[in-house]
């Protein structure tokens, strides 16, 4: 009843592949940061496994992750965000595998939102705008955005545009007339912080006008 794994458990554990990946989200809930980790092998038996982070923390030397189904996470203000932390998979007191990680290099931004497209008849173009919660943040403020759009019938033929602002102009002549388009956007850290692409924003759908159509604002479908 001591909370330590039995020897047999450890021997079995050592046969498994405990490689894992993590991402951080800074100021994801007010001033709280989060750290999320998961095993790369979805079939790993996680029954008695825990994640622990030590180092580059304020107030405590180590913190235990909370388990929620297949993922492990921490939400706290106590990441120092300077230097590397040691993240370990543990069975009781025994570490099965560890990684030294600087949490500022595994940042996954929050997904952009409020994506919309407005057609400007006089200019013969489409103004794409979206919002990001990172404009209000203290840390991860500078992002690179990836706007992807496609004609709805072209399932895998996405056109990508990278930009640092939250506004993009698409020329009407570059798009097919009288066609339905899907557009979406994601973000990645672009200054000091490093990491991963955010999730995609919800898609926005718009129709291009006929060649001689004088319609105004593009309505979402």
């Amino acid at each position: 009843e001591s909370g330590y794994a039995q020897n047999g458990d450890l021997e079995d554990a050592e046969l498994d592949d405990y490689s894992f990946s993590c991402y951080s989200q800074l100021e994801v809930n007010g001033s709280q940061h989060s750290l999320t980790c998961a095993f790369e092998d979805p079939d790993v038996n996680i029954t008695n496994l825990e994640f622990e982070i030590c180092g580059a923390l304020v107030e405590v030397k180590c913190l235990n992750f909370r388990k929620l189904q297949e993922i492990y996470f921490i939400e706290t203000k106590k990441f120092l965000l300077i230097g590397k932390s040691n993240i370990c998979v543990k069975v009781g007191e025994k570490s099965l595998t560890c990684k030294k990680i600087d949490l500022t290099t595994i940042v996954k931004p929050e997904a952009p939102f409020d994506l919309s497209v407005v057609y400007r008849e006089g200019a013969n173009d489409f103004v794409v705008t979206f919002n990001t919660s990172h404009l209000q943040k203290k840390y991860v403020k500078v992002l690179m955005h990836d706007v992807a759009y496609r004609q709805e019938k072209d399932e895998n033929k996405w056109t990508h545009v990278n930009l640092s602002s939250t506004k993009l102009t698409l020329l009407q002549r570059k798009l097919q007339p009288a066609a339905m388009y899907e557009i979406k956007v994601r973000s990645i850290p672009d200054h000091y912080f490093k990491g991963f692409w955010s999730e995609w924003s919800p898609s926005y759908y718009f129709r291009t006008p006929e060649i001689n159509n004088s319609s105004g604002e593009m309505d979402p479908i």
Epitope: E59, L63, R66, I74, G92
Partner: antibody, heavy 122, light 107 residues
Framework: QVQLVESGGGLVKPGGSLRLSCAVS????????MAWIRQAPGKGLEWVST????????YYPDSVKGRFTISRDNAKNSLYLQMNSLRAEDTAVYYC???????????????WGQGTLVTVSS | DIQMTQSPSSLSASVGDRVTITCRTS??????LAWYQQKPGKAPKLLLY???TLHIGVPSRFSGSGSGTDYTLTISSLQPEDFATYFC?????????FGGGTKVEIK
Amino acid sequence: QVQLVESGGGLVKPGGSLRLSCAVSGFTLSDYYMAWIRQAPGKGLEWVSTISASGLRTYYPDSVKGRFTISRDNAKNSLYLQMNSLRAEDTAVYYCARPLSAHYGFNYFDYWGQGTLVTVSS
Amino acid sequence: DIQMTQSPSSLSASVGDRVTITCRTSEDIYQGLAWYQQKPGKAPKLLLYSANTLHIGVPSRFSGSGSGTDYTLTISSLQPEDFATYFCQQYYDYPLAFGGGTKVEIK
């Protein structure tokens, strides 16, 4: 409201054993690390043991390591301390305590039981 | 293990006095420090954590400061109900440790 009620204390001879229980209510036990802290008569506070929220990790000071075992039964809303090979210096009021913060292991305690007295004497 | 040195072990003061209690640790605890108040026959009560964060419901006359290895609890204007014993506690690392306590008595 949050309540922690210890029981199981009493008089025991040196070398004997005792099992303390702490019945909790008013919060989800499985969300919290839990701890036992003791106070010898007229003395200061001494941390005795901590168990992680999952129950998979346990922590002890050298003074009780190998003699005391902390455990929990989240389904029964109970925390336990099994004390073996008791010594005169283990005489104290034993408190169970809950940290303010759930889940991660910030061990400062905002809820304490009323304490149960353990006396080790021949 | 982190050692805790709390001083003074006791002090006499009057209502309205400003009282300061110090806690020194043997190594940097990165503000992983809590303060408790205990009255005879009762369990301790949490006053502050994170070295300087007042626990909910605790009067604002209590304050905490410090970093590294040196920490202070201050009672700006001592009230009759503040006569008690005060303990500091480090929670930066295991084993958790408490200071020896400071008994605040009526002068």
